[in-house]
Structure formats: structure tokens, C-alpha cells
């Protein structure tokens, strides 16, 4: 037999399948030119010493052989004895270590039999009533086709499914898509009609995300406030990375998660913007405010579940910072300023109050005064900490309000608000004999003292009533008893308790007159 | 009045170093995170290395990795970048920016970079 | 290459509106922030629009942004002389760990 012409003999090697895993699959034959003709066909194995054989039945029974040698692709004209314009079946056979192993037939109809490619380019892929569209671009001149997919996940094999017969300049299928996992799909295109051609090869790998993208397992820790008056955020764990299927690991478009930080700042409410959504590469600083912090994760499907971490207002008080000063036009703040041009929020509560009561209030940018100070001023008729009662003070400061990021703490300090001085006056101050020249003054706690940091000292006067001569004691705030000495007996005393602020002197308590009986010896 | 200064630029032989610096003024450097963005003759704008503000974070373009290192003083109000193994295609005009959430707010006058035998 | 597409140049007379165009990806315009930067003939770039559609103090309202999906979009009504320049857009890429920038568009007024 002529190499270019089918040969109607016995093939040169016995008739046995020997029906091994490994051998000749995939075949495809297609016309390629007016009179030329193609088969190629895939071989599975140890490829030394293989010698490949193209099977060609006619319709009429005969049968003939083209031998390929350790080739897996074949090229014959329409005048090498097979028919063309009839249905033909075709085969390979491989001869190898003396067995020899058969592809499945493919019976086809050669002349209409053309090679068709599978998707080319840019494959879209969108997500359509909870399942998955892919859309591509028909390939030039082969409009008419039967489309199959093929996908996979990280831990299941391949399942073939069917896209249905398309018949336009652009082709598409419905899909299944996963909830949870990646998933791999390739496509593959027929001649639509045309019965027995080919399928195309399988296209390059299309990488689909779960409908969901992973929920991120990561934990925050936040530093300490630095002197800036902020504190660096941490991430403890990275996001959990999505498992791939073999053709999408490396670099698979498509799978991509992205995780973003989403950052709600609680505090200071009379702010412009409470919400910023951060890349998690570029963790911020925030102030010292309390933080509800999320990190979302989203996919070309769009975000998934976010998972949300509660971050507490720094507590860190520095009670001689803030100035206060109590006039008859209202009260005024003072504090060491920040920089030029600050916008300052001042955040205000009563103590033991949940944090949403919080009332604040924001400056317009204002530069430091010739005494490095920065202001805020409230008139009474305001209403602003004027209950008589212990409020908790934060001061933060921007040059760019209108930036999450940028706010910064001054100082967190406690304030007694209305007329403190008043308030404060102790009660129930009682004289007790201690000794011939002694007495005990005792008193309950100033309103003052449930405000850490605010009462500075108890001062107690005695007064000698007879030589108006007058006495005054400090008395440590903690403390709220104190023994006078050096008194005289039968003299009329009177003793009175205030308690002071560092800004301001608080108010005498009602004398409390009382003297030392003398002593009658027997 | 807000301001950035570059300097540091010059001619510079292929395989030679340079040290860039940027002078910060009119605000608080060292709440602000910091980048270096550079431009060929004629082209557009490249992205070349991103600082935060303390330092503690900092990414380079793939373009430069390993050859450029971005640096900071806050006590100083600078910025420098590091150039070793110059290229030829490393000419530029190389600017300073501030950065504010992702958008570049602040931009220097720039200071021009020749490579060249 | 750059890694967000801009068109080299647009144009139109004065008074007239124009859009320029940035596309890129869900790791870049999908997922960040997009700002915009204008380049006048010899002079550093100034930031024009930022957080997708907001104007610093002092830039006109004429100057706006938006962002679709992965595609930003600036645009500029009322035209002048004036604005006459390069225009770029740029954003973060969450993959890269990077900034990035379109290759500029070149803005003549007719």
C-alpha cells in the first residue's frame, strides 16, 4: 500500500483490544482545505515505541488503515480510497508491547465535517437567577453549533453538561452555581447538524467563585494611644483564602476574593462622615473613639457575609488637660491645641450612661491662641452638661473632618456640669468629741467625688467664735474626715466643709457650731 | 500654606544610587501617609511607593522592588526615597504626594532623575 | 501598559460637555475608591475628584465623577480654555498591592 492512500488490508498486528486505561481517546477528523482532510486524535501513556493506526470503515463494510507511526495527527486527500461524501467510521488503534489499544469510533460524514474551535477570548460571566451565564463571542465563520461544559471543584471530578444548540454571533450557556466552592469550567463546541463531527478541543479554564465569597475568620488588636493621640489597628490572622480547582490554581481570574475594611466610628456623632470603607493592606490609626469594624469579603458576584468586631473607646483620662472656666455669660474649654487650622468634636455624657446618649458638638477650624490653647464656649441657655451631675469629656481634633481616618484624641477627661460648686457643698458634717483639745469632723462624700479627677480637695474651716480667729484645713479628696487639735475648752467653735475643683472653689457646707465642754476636776 | 519640596534629583550613570527627599510644611506630616509617584518625558503618571504614617506599612511597584526603599522622618517632616541600580528607565520627574483615604491630596513640584552613560 | 484604560485624547469646543473614561477590574475600580487628577502643561498634577465622585474646596462644580461596576467616569461641562490638559484617573489594586493609574488623557479644547 502507497503511505498517502488507505490501505484495504489486515492491519500489521493482531486483532485485540486489550482494554487498558491507557491508549488512543479524542479523536477528531474535519476537512481543513477543498480536498484535504485532518484526524488528531490525543494518546494516554508511555508513548516509546507506539505505532499509531487510523481504522476507516466505509459504509459498505470495507475497512482500511493508515499507518501514522508514533504521529497523533494525520493528514489524506479525498483520493487516498476513503469516502468523503458519505458516512465513514473511524478509529485508532495503537500497537504497543505487543497489545493493542482502540479509541472510541467517531462516524462522521468527512466533507461536512469542519473543525470547529472552541470559545476564543474574553468569556463573560454573570450570575443570573441563582445560576451562572457564560457569554462569549461566536468564532468567525462558525456560527451554528452544538456547545457541551465540563466543571469541576477542588474536590469532585469533572461532570459534563449541556449548553443546548446556538445559532447567533454570540453563543451562551446556563450553568450550576455553587454556593460555596470555586468551581472550573471548559466549553467545547460541535458543528451543529452535522452528524458525527467532531468536538472541538476543550477551551482554556474559566474560573467561577462561589455565590458566595468565604466569610473572613480574622481578629483585630488595637495598640495603645500614642501621644498623637492614636492607635494602630491591627489584623491578628489573615482572611482565609479561597481552595481552587487544579486548572485555576495560580493566577485564575475570575476566583479572586477581595476583603475591605469597613469602619464605623461611634463616637463623636455630630460629625460629617461616620462610615469608610479601607483596604485591609493599608490598616489605619484611629483615635481613641469607639469602632464598630467590618471586614467584608465580595466576589465578581458581588459582597457576602461581613463579619463585625466591636472596637472600645480608649478610657486613658489625663484630668489636668482640660481648662475650665465657669462665667456669668456661660462656661469655656480650654486645651493645649493641636495644629493649625483643627476642627475639634467635643463628645459629652453622664457618667454610667449607655454610650448612645453621648451629645457632642464641633468647632469650626480654629488656630491655636497666642497661649497655645484651643476653645469651646457653651451659654447656659444652651442646656450643654448643665445638670448637676458627672459628665465624661473627649475632645478629639481633624484637619479633615470629613476623613474617618484622620481624627485624632486630644484627651478624655471628667467634668462636673451646672453649678458644681453648689452641688458639691458636703452634707451630714458631724463634730465629734476626740480628745481634751480635739475634735473628729466628719462629713459624707461631695457629689464631686463621684467624678474621677474633678475634686482636687475638701478644705475645712474652723472659727473660733469669741477671737473670730479663722483656720482652714486641705483634706485629701479620698479622705472625709479630718481632726482639728489645738482647740480650747469652753470656747464656741463653728466648722464648715467645701469641696474645691482645680477650676473652681466650692461652696461652705452650713456651720456646724459646737465646743469642748470643760473638764470639772473632783 | 501646605507644602511639598523635592530635591535630591540629578544625572546619574546607570547602575548608580540617588537620594530623594521631600520637605513637608504647613501641616502635621506624621498623621498623613506619603507616596512617591514618578513620570517619564512624555508619559503618563507611575505609581512607585506608598509609606503610612508611621512607617509600619509600606508597598513598592513591582517596577522598583528591590532597587528603590522608601523612608521617613516625622521629627524631620521628610520623606526619602532610595534609588539603587539605576536604569535608564528610570528617568523621570519623581513627585511626592500626601495621601489622604486613597486619594493624593497633595501634590510636590517635582524633582527631575536622568540615567544616563 | 498601564493597568486602568483611559482614552489617549479627547476633545470638544468650549462650552461643550466631555466625559473621559478609566476602566479596570474588581480588584481595582470594582472593589476601591477612584480618584481623578488634572495635569496642566508643566505643572504637577492637582487632585480634581476623589472617593469616586467628591470635589475638593475650590475645584468648580463643573468637574464631577461616578463609578458603574469596574469603569469610572469624569466628566466636564462648560468647557474652557483652561482646561486644557492631561486628565488621570487612579485607584488602589487590592491584588497588586499597588497603586495604579490610567494612561492619561490628553483634553484639547477646539
Known amino acids: 500500500c502507497r503511505t498517502s492512500e488507505c490501505c484495504f488490508q489486515d492491519p500489521p498486528y493482531p486483532d485485540a483490544d486489550s482494554g487498558s486505561a491507557s491508549g488512543p481517546r479524542d479523536l477528531r477528523c474535519y476537512r481543513i482545505s477543498s480536498d484535504r482532510y485532518e484526524c488528531s486524535w490525543q494518546y494516554e501513556g508511555p508513548t516509546a515505541g507506539v505505532s499509531h493506526f487510523l481504522r476507516c470503515c466505509l459504509s459498505s463494510g470495507r475497512c482500511c488503515y493508515f499507518a501514522a507511526g508514533s504521529a497523533t495527527r494525520l493528514q489524506f486527500s479525498d483520493q487516498a480510497g476513503v469516502s468523503v461524501l458519505y458516512t465513514v467510521t473511524l478509529w485508532v488503534e495503537s500497537w504497543a508491547r505487543n497489545q493493542t489499544e482502540k479509541s472510541p469510533e467517531v462516524t462522521l460524514q468527512l466533507y461536512n465535517s469542519v473543525k470547529y474551535e472552541p470559545p476564543l477570548g474574553d468569556i463573560k460571566v454573570s450570575k443570573l437567577a441563582g445560576q451562572l451565564r457564560m457569554e462569549w463571542e461566536t468564532p468567525d465563520n462558525q456560527v451554528g453549533a452544538e456547545v457541551q461544559f465540563r466543571h469541576r471543584t477542588p474536590s469532585s471530578p469533572w461532570k459534563l453538561g449541556d449548553c443546548g444548540p446556538q445559532d447567533d454571533d454570540t453563543e451562551s450557556c446556563l450553568c450550576p452555581l455553587e454556593m460555596n466552592v470555586a468551581q472550573e469550567f471548559q466549553l467545547r463546541r460541535r458543528q451543529l447538524g452535522s452528524q458525527g463531527s467532531s468536538w472541538s478541543k476543550w477551551s482554556s479554564p474559566v474560573c467561577v467563585p462561589p455565590e458566595n465569597p468565604p466569610q473572613p475568620q480574622v481578629r483585630f488588636s488595637v495598640e495603645q494611644l500614642g501621644q498623637d493621640g492614636r492607635r494602630r489597628l491591627t489584623l491578628k490572622e489573615q482572611p482565609t483564602q479561597l481552595e481552587l480547582p487544579e486548572g485555576c490554581q495560580g493566577l485564575a481570574p475570575g476566583t479572586e476574593v477581595t476583603y475591605r475594611l469597613q469602619l464605623h466610628m461611634l463616637s463623636c456623632p455630630c460629625k460629617a462622615k461616620a462610615t469608610r470603607t479601607l483596604h485591609l493592606g493599608k490598616m489605619p490609626y484611629l483615635s481613641g473613639a469607639a469602632y464598630n469594624v467590618a471586614v467584608i469579603s465580595s466576589n465578581q458576584f458581588g459582597p457576602g457575609l461581613n463579619q463585625t468586631w466591636h472596637i472600645p473607646a480608649d478610657t486613658h483620662t489625663e484630668p489636668v488637660a482640660l481648662n475650665i472656666s465657669v462665667g456669668t455669660n456661660g462656661t469655656t474649654m480650654y486645651w493645649p491645641a493641636r495644629a493649625q487650622s483643627m476642627t475639634y468634636c467635643i463628645e459629652w455624657q453622664p457618667v454610667g450612661q449607655d454610650g448612645g446618649l453621648a451629645t457632642c458638638s464641633l468647632t469650626a477650624p480654629q488656630d491655636p491662641d497666642p497661649a497655645g490653647m484651643a476653645t469651646y464656649s457653651w451659654s447656659r441657655e444652651s442646656g450643654a452638661m448643665g445638670q448637676e451631675k458627672c459628665y465624661y469629656i473627649t475632645i478629639f481634633a481633624s484637619a479633615h473632618p470629613e476623613k474617618l481616618t484622620l481624627w485624632s484624641t486630644v484627651l478624655s477627661t471628667y467634668h462636673f456640669g451646672g453649678n458644681a460648686s453648689a452641688a458639691g457643698t458636703p452634707h451630714h458634717v458631724s463634730v465629734k468629741n476626740h480628745s481634751l483639745d480635739s475634735v473628729s469632723v466628719d462629713w459624707a462624700p461631695s457629689l464631686l467625688s463621684t467624678c474621677p479627677g474633678v475634686l482636687k480637695e475638701y478644705v475645712v474651716r474652723c472659727r473660733d467664735e469669741d477671737s473670730k480667729q479663722v483656720s482652714e484645713h486641705p483634706v485629701q479628696p479620698t479622705e472625709t474626715q479630718v481632726t482639728l487639735s489645738g482647740l480650747r475648752a469652753g470656747v464656741a467653735y463653728t466648722v464648715q466643709v467645701r469641696a474645691d475643683t482645680a477650676w473652681l472653689r466650692g461652696v461652705w457646707s452650713q456651720p456646724q457650731r459646737f465646743s469642748i465642754e470643760v473638764q470639772v476636776s473632783d | 500654606e501646605v507644602q511639598l519640596v523635592e530635591s535630591g534629583g540629578g544625572l546619574v550613570q546607570p547602575g548608580g544610587s540617588l537620594r530623594l527627599s521631600c520637605a513637608a510644611s504647613?501641616?502635621?506630616?506624621?498623621?498623613?501617609?506619603m507616596n512617591w509617584v514618578r513620570q517619564a518625558p512624555g508619559k503618563g503618571l507611575e505609581w512607585i511607593s506608598y509609606?503610612?504614617?508611621?512607617?509600619?506599612?509600606?508597598y513598592y511597584a513591582d517596577s522598583v522592588k528591590g532597587r528603590f526603599t522608601i523612608s521617613r522622618d516625622n521629627a524631620k517632616n521628610s520623606l526619602y526615597l532610595q534609588m539603587n541600580s539605576l536604569r535608564d528607565e528610570d528617568t523621570a520627574l519623581y513627585y511626592c504626594a500626601r495621601e489622604i483615604e486613597d486619594s493624593m491630596d497633595v501634590w510636590g513640584q517635582g524633582t527631575t532623575v536622568t540615567v544616563s552613560s | 501598559q498601564s493597568v486602568l484604560t483611559q482614552p489617549p485624547s479627547v476633545s470638544a469646543a468650549p462650552g461643550q460637555k466631555v466625559t473621559i473614561s478609566c476602566s479596570g477590574s474588581s480588584s481595582n475600580i470594582g472593589n476601591n475608591y477612584v480618584s481623578w487628577y488634572q495635569q496642566l502643561p508643566g505643572t504637577a498634577p492637582k487632585l480634581l475628584i476623589y472617593d469616586n465622585n467628591e470635589r475638593p474646596s475650590g475645584i468648580p462644580d463643573r468637574f464631577s465623577g461616578s463609578k458603574s461596576g469596574t469603569s469610572a467616569t469624569l466628566g466636564i461641562t462648560g468647557l474652557q480654555p483652561g482646561d486644557e490638559a492631561d486628565y488621570y484617573c487612579g485607584t488602589w489594586d487590592s491584588s497588586l498591592s499597588a497603586g495604579v493609574f490610567g494612561g492619561g488623557t490628553k483634553l484639547t479644547v477646539l
Open positions: 504647613g501641616f502635621t506630616f506624621s498623621s498623613y501617609d
Open positions: 509609606i503610612n504614617s508611621r512607617s509600619s506599612t509600606i
